[in-house]
Structures are given as C-alpha cells and as structure tokens.
Amino acid sequence: ELCDDDPPEIPHATFKAMAYKEGTMLNCECKRGFRRIKSGSLYMLCTGNSSHSSWDNQCQCTSSATRNTTKQVTPQPEEQKERKTTEMQSPMQPVDQASLPGHCREPPPWENEATERIYHFVVGQMVYYQCVQGYRALHRGPAESVCKMTHGKTRWTQPQLICTGEMETSQFPGEEKPQASPEGRPESETSCLVTTTDFQIQTEMAATMETSIFTTEYQ
C-alpha cells in the first residue's frame, strides 16, 4: 500500500530513508536537457523474495537533442564524484541496511539523473530527520517518521526535531545523551503522495536507538 502523502516537513530539516521497503518506487527522472529513453522505465521498483531484495528496472537518460543515443546506467567512479549521490555511512546502525529483510539499499545513481529523487513510499517505511547545514538540533525527541495505516488511511508519525540556526541565541548546556526508544503520543493529525528528498548536506543525525551518519556530496 502506497503512502498517500509526503513525510512531515520540519523547518530547516531534511529526511532520508536508510533502506527502502519492498514496493517502494523511484521515478526515473532526468536532469534538464535530458529525457528518459523511449523504451525506458518510468520508475525503479524495490522487489524481492524472502532472502534478497533489489531494484527492478533501470533508469536511462538520453540527451533531448539526440534521438537514438542511449547512455549506460552505471556511472564511472570519477563521474560518480561529480553527481549528487547519497553515500550511506552508518557504522553504528543496529542492522546493516543491506541485510535488512524486505528492504532495498539506496539505488546507485544513473547518468544524467535529476538532482532530486522522487520516491513513492509504502506503508511501514521509516525516514530519519536531521537539521540542514548551518542549523543544529535544539530539541531532538524521536527524530524519525513512519508511514502507518490507520482506519484505512495512511499517515506519517510526527518526528520530534527542532532546528535552530547556529547564530541564533540558543543555549546548549551539554551534548545530547543517547536516545531511548520512545513511547507514542496521540496524533494531532491524520495526514497522509510522492516524496522528494534532496540531500545536499553533511551533518550528523540521531536515529532512534543509535547514532548514524549519512553524507551527500554536492553536485
């Protein structure tokens, strides 16, 4: 079941999935001046069996100016450096995302991919929040959101993160302590399309049980 809405938006924060549940779709979007090849897939789909999950279909972009040329999906290592890529660095995660049953890793980039990835999430997907560059967490409760099905409708739980500019008049008396697994709270909102994530930051984020770090390179 696809989630009806985007994960919640937090001022000066952005979110990221550590792994993608089976059923997740990623639009095959191309950057300006490029388009999907005629016979190309509209989206990649996370599929799998009990032991292994992977992305079906491949996204391929071609120059809008040329009709017949198709480019390879897998970029060369030096090309990868100049793209916007999400490099997952989560050494302290309880479960390695690659081995999480029923989940796919972040798909590798394809050549001439759009700068923003548009995911269609499914029920059960969890995303993690962090403050964008230049901001830090004034408050961080459970800094994740999960797409849940309630009374036949999907909704995202609310992440508890308040980001403040480093130049603002905040007082940070001490480092944050490890986050314990939280109890729930009544939802004030039953919200709950298509999700865009554009990570162009380098910062630290606390997941529910452990601290995990993910970075992205500037394009």
């Epitope: 001022p11 004034l138 408050h139 609310q158 944050e176 302590k177 709270r185």
Partner: antibody, heavy 118, light 107 residues
Framework: EVQLVQSGAEVKKPGATVKISCKVS????????MHWVQQAPGKGLEWMGV????????NYNQKFKGRVTITADTSTDTAYMELSSLRSEDTAVYYC???????????WGQGTLVTVSS | DIQMTQSPSSLSASVGDRVTITCKAS??????LSWFQQKPGKAPKTLIY???RLVSGVPSRFSGSGSGQDYTLTISSLQPEDMATYYC?????????FGQGTKLEIK
C-alpha cells in the same frame, strides 16, 4: 489523554520574580519540547522561549532581555518558567504549550495569571 | 526578528459570509505558518499549520493559503461559534512571532 496543568495565579510586587510550573501527563515528557507564551490583558500572544525537555537546550525571545529562564525537571515531568525583575507590563496570562513535530503548540496549559502590582 | 503584520485588526460579518484574514511576514517564511483561534478565557487552538494544512478535527470551512511572505485564512461560511480572535504565527525562525490578532464578531 494529554494534559498540561499549570500552577495557580500569582500576585507579585515590581522587581520580584515569579516561577510558574507546567506538569504534563499522557505522553513521554522528554519527547516533546515545551514553549512558553505570554498574553497581556486584551493583548496578543508573545512567544517567550522554548526548552528541549530531552537535553535542556533553550532558545529565548530577546524581548525579555535575559529576564526569562525556562527549565525542565524530567523526574517530575514538569517544565518551569521563571520571570525576574517584574514590572507592571508583565501582568499577563502565561501559557505552556508543547511543540509537536511539524507544527508548534498543539497542546496548551490552562494558563496562569500573574499580576504585578505594588 | 520576523515581523508578522495581520489585517484587519477586527471585522464584523454575518453567518454564512465568507471571511478572509491576511498575514504578511517581513521576509519569506517558506510556508511555516500556523493559524490559531482563541476564544475569551481559553487557550488558543491550532486550526492550520504549514500555511494550508488543516489540523484533524477542525471544520473544513477553515482553509489556509499563501506562500513566501503573504498568507490568508479563509472561513468559507461563517458560523456563530467562529466568533473569536484569530492569530497567525511564523515558526520558520526563532524567535517565533505572532500576528497582532483579528477579532471576528458576528453581526
């Protein structure tokens, strides 16, 4: 059921200090930040500051020029707002309110009237 | 600090009327704006957040719109129970700032 219960009305003399409490129940106290809002009689709302109940971080409205201190006691699930060097224009109702994820102030205390009079 | 200029400061309208209240921020607040309703002697209640998202349980006659610096609260068909003071709030940057309020009276 989520509840924020504030301490009772106070009458203070100019120059004095008042400390208002806000006891919460119905959710995990350290998950949600706590804000304080001032409302003078017949006037609008003024944000005073916020505390992270999780780590004690604070952010204050400089309009109150260092006179406000917000604290939290996780052992009693209670937040406090202390306002010092009181003057007559501090006569107001003070509210505590939780910040809930992507919008602030979903749950409010009932308000505490502080009267500053000589 | 971000200034929020709310207008009108008061208005009188009849039951069934369409009512609009506006808020202008002194800078772009990227739609991080809430609308509150406050009745005498009561704490404020959130109606709208993120400029246009209705809080669960709030009647659908309330709606919000706007982006950048300019925002609007609309009551599509005024009801007697809507008599209250309405405030906007920006929560894009600290310190959070409220509009001055709009007192809505029923003719």
């Amino acid at each position: 059921e989520v509840q924020l219960v504030q301490s009772g009305a106070e009458v203070k003399k100019p120059g004095a200090t008042v400390k208002i409490s806000c006891k919460v129940s119905g959710y995990t106290f350290t998950d949600y930040a706590m804000h304080w809002v001032q409302q003078a009689p017949g006037k609008g709302l003024e944000w005073m500051g916020v505390i992270s109940t999780y780590n004690g971080n604070t952010n204050y409205n400089q309009k109150f020029k260092g006179r406000v201190t917000i604290t939290a006691d996780t052992s009693t699930d209670t937040a406090y707002m202390e306002l010092s060097s009181l003057r007559s224009e501090d006569t107001a109702v003070y509210y505590c309110a939780t910040s809930y994820g992507n919008y602030p102030f979903d749950y409010w205390g009932q308000g505490t009237l502080v009267t500053v009079s000589s | 600090d971000i200034q929020m200029t709310q207008s009108p400061s008061s208005l009188s309208a009849s039951v069934g009327d369409r009512v609009t209240i506006t808020c202008k921020a002194s800078q772009d607040i990227t739609s991080y704006l809430s609308w509150f309703q406050q009745k005498p002697g009561k704490a404020p209640k959130t109606l709208i957040y993120r400029a246009n998202r209705l809080v669960s349980g709030v009647p659908s006659r309330f709606s919000g719109s706007g982006s950048g610096q300019d925002y609007t609260l609309t009551i599509s068909s005024l009801q007697p129970e809507d008599m209250a003071t309405y405030y906007c709030l920006q929560y894009d940057e600290f310190p959070y700032t409220f509009g001055q309020g709009t007192k809505l009276e029923i003719k």
